[in-house]
């Protein structure tokens, strides 16, 4: 049979997902119901590996599968009739498959830094980069991340800095390729903690009797993490700035003369059974010298006529020595110290003085 040459196809339409493209087109010849169509699909920059699809007669759509996400392709469509008589020119259309979303990403805290490290493996296919969104309450930040390659299964990472401590952040990462955006991958991550900010003031110390004092102080600010505990420290020495070193000394060490500074009382804030908000500053009042025991620290009686200063240590993380049961490991804890209070001098023991006078 003799056939006239089919005219060229027109109005090519493409709809894509990550790995497939559905193509539809038109041919306005009266004889078009007798045509089949030959499709050549070529990945940009890879003409040696074209895929060919031939439709059944009269079919003006086709789905091409096993494509690479986020990649650019060109399709050429020839109309053909009879024994391979083709249209002079193919209809041509360029398109991109949709980029693949990141499967997931992990967050890691950075010790003692208000930052998060995000880690992910590159999604399959091609990408031009990623959009990173970080938000918490009214604060938000959007930045771009560079592209990655999925070929060798490398783990990629980025550090998100200038955050707040102990704060929950909503994070989303979106793959971009060919001007298209994948569905965002979301995660909620919380930053770590560090030493609390030291308070401006010092505790207030007042004499109650010849062997006890009352120490009053305000709770530390919780902006670097929730305050987990406080330690009340006494000294009879020169009141320099205390270091984590003093946390190992107990009343017994003080009595033996091993140290002029010791921890007399420990408060675990969780025991209050309420969470402290950032703006809520609690007031504490401690009776020092009442012979109570908190963990490994004995709150022993003070020396009459002794001169004492008090300081408070606040902890966002309190760690105890594995071998010295109940004693704080200063090096492993997250701690800061108030300044020492003014000194208070205890009165003499009136009863003892009276007893001495009668003999």
């Amino acid at each position: 049979a003799q056939y006239t040459r089919p005219s060229n196809v027109s109005n090519i339409d493409v709809s894509t997902n990550t790995t497939a493209a559905t193509l539809s087109w038109q041919n306005f010849d009266d004889a078009s119901p007798t045509y089949s169509y030959c499709l050549l699909i070529e990945k940009a920059g890879n003409s040696s590996n074209a895929t060919q699809v031939v439709t059944d007669i009269g079919i003006t759509d086709a789905t091409v599968t096993e494509l690479i996400p986020g990649s650019s392709y060109t399709v050429e469509i020839f109309a053909q009739v009879g024994d391979g008589i083709k249209s002079l020119e193919p209809g041509r259309k360029s398109f991109c498959t949709d980029p693949a979303s990141m499967a997931s990403f992990d967050c890691e805290v950075v010790p003692k830094e208000p930052a998060l490290v995000l880690k992910w493996t590159c999604p399959p296919g091609a990408n031009a980069g990623f959009e990173l969104e970080v938000s918490s309450g009214a604060w938000n930040n959007a930045t771009h991340l560079e592209s990655c390659s999925s070929e060798n299964g490398t783990e990629y990472r980025t550090e998100v800095t200038y955050l707040n401590f102990s704060t929950s952040y909503n994070i989303s990462i979106t793959t971009v390729s060919c001007g298209k955006m994948a569905a965002p991958t979301r995660n909620t991550c919380t930053t770590g903690i560090t030493d609390p900010p030291p308070p401006d003031g010092s505790p207030n110390i007042t004499s109650v009797s010849h062997n006890s004092v009352k120490v009053k102080f305000s709770g530390f600010e919780a902006s670097h993490g929730p305050i987990k505990a406080y330690a009340v420290i006494l000294t009879t020495g020169e009141a320099g700035h205390p270091s984590a070193d003093v946390l190992k000394y107990t009343y017994e060490d003080f009595k033996k003369g091993a140290s002029d500074t010791y921890v007399t009382y420990l408060i675990r804030t969780e025991e209050k059974g309420r969470s402290q908000s950032l703006s809520e500053v609690l007031k504490y009042e401690i009776d020092v010298g009442n012979e109570s025991t908190t963990l490994g620290y004995y709150n022993g009686k003070l020396e009459p006529l002794g001169s004492y200063r008090a300081c408070v240590a606040g902890f966002t993380n309190i760690t105890f020595h594995p071998q010295n049961k109940g004693l704080i490991d200063g090096a492993e804890s997250y701690v800061s110290f108030s300044r020492y209070s003014d000194a208070v001098s205890l009165p003499q023991d009136v009863a003892a003085a009276h007893h001495h006078h009668h003999h």
Epitope: A128, G129, E131, E133, S135, N140, N141, A142, H144, N170, I171, S172, T174, V176, S177, C178, G179, K180, M181, A182, A183, P184, R186
Partner: antibody, heavy 117, light 107 residues
């Protein structure tokens, strides 16, 4: 085929409000960062506002901060720009656009906003 | 804000000629630069961006180059349909900013 169609422009007096809409089709709207860009008559282009996909974070140029609000309705595939306390210098054609990696890829045909007494 | 200085303000070219438009950023923008073409009464059209060396449907006679603060758009073999205003734009930092535009005319 990606299509963005802006509407809601018109003549408005200084100090009054106007709400622009941008109807999106041909792509998965909820996946995209979106923006409004404006162009004053015979002038250049100026980015106005931006909204992300994940948590809908918003960003504005300083001159419209506190007066304009960008928002999106993913169910309706529509982007909005609520413009309050309008000034004569807000007179422009307003375009909505997709904005992956900081580039305005697809643009609508624009809607003209004229602020005049 | 990052300032984008575009040169020249206008130029005219003959059919088949090669033209270049330059864009200078006031600070490094890590290649997050895009070029647009706008014809009278029409919306701008993306030509080239960080993510798209050449956007869909843009003829291969358009090319972009540059890094750091200096970028350029080259149009080889000038055609009548290339007439219009060309804008560069940085998408590195908010607020995203455009150059003032370059008007390209056919001689």
């Amino acid at each position: 085929e990606v299509k963005l169609v802006e509407s809601g422009g018109g003549l408005v007096q200084p100090g009054r409000s106007l709400k622009l809409s941008c109807a999106a089709s041909g792509f998965t709207f909820s996946n995209y960062y979106m923006a409004w860009v404006r162009q004053a008559p015979t002038k250049g282009l100026e980015w106005v506002a931006y909204i992300t996909n994940g948590y809908g974070s918003t960003y504005y140029r300083d001159s419209v901060k506190g007066r304009f609000t960008i928002s999106r309705d993913n169910a309706k595939s529509t982007l909005y720009l609520q413009m309050d306390s309008l000034r004569s210098e807000d007179t422009a054609t307003y375009y909505c656009s997709t904005v992956p990696l900081g580039a305005f890829v697809y643009w609508g045909q624009g809607t003209l906003v004229t602020v005049s007494s | 804000d990052i300032q984008m200085t575009q040169t020249p303000h206008s130029l005219s070219a003959s059919l088949g000629e090669t033209v270049s438009i330059e864009c200078l950023a006031s600070e490094g923008i890590s290649n997050y630069l895009a070029w647009y073409q706008q014809k009278p009464g029409k919306s701008p059209q993306l030509l080239i961006s960080h993510a798209n060396p050449l956007h869909d449907g843009v003829p291969s006679r358009f090319s972009g180059s540059g890094s750091g603060t200096q970028y350029s758009l080259k149009i080889r073999n000038m055609q009548p349909e290339d007439e219009g205003v060309y804008y560069c734009q940085q998408g590195y930092k908010f607020p995203y900013t455009f150059g003032a535009g370059t008007k390209l005319e056919l001689k």
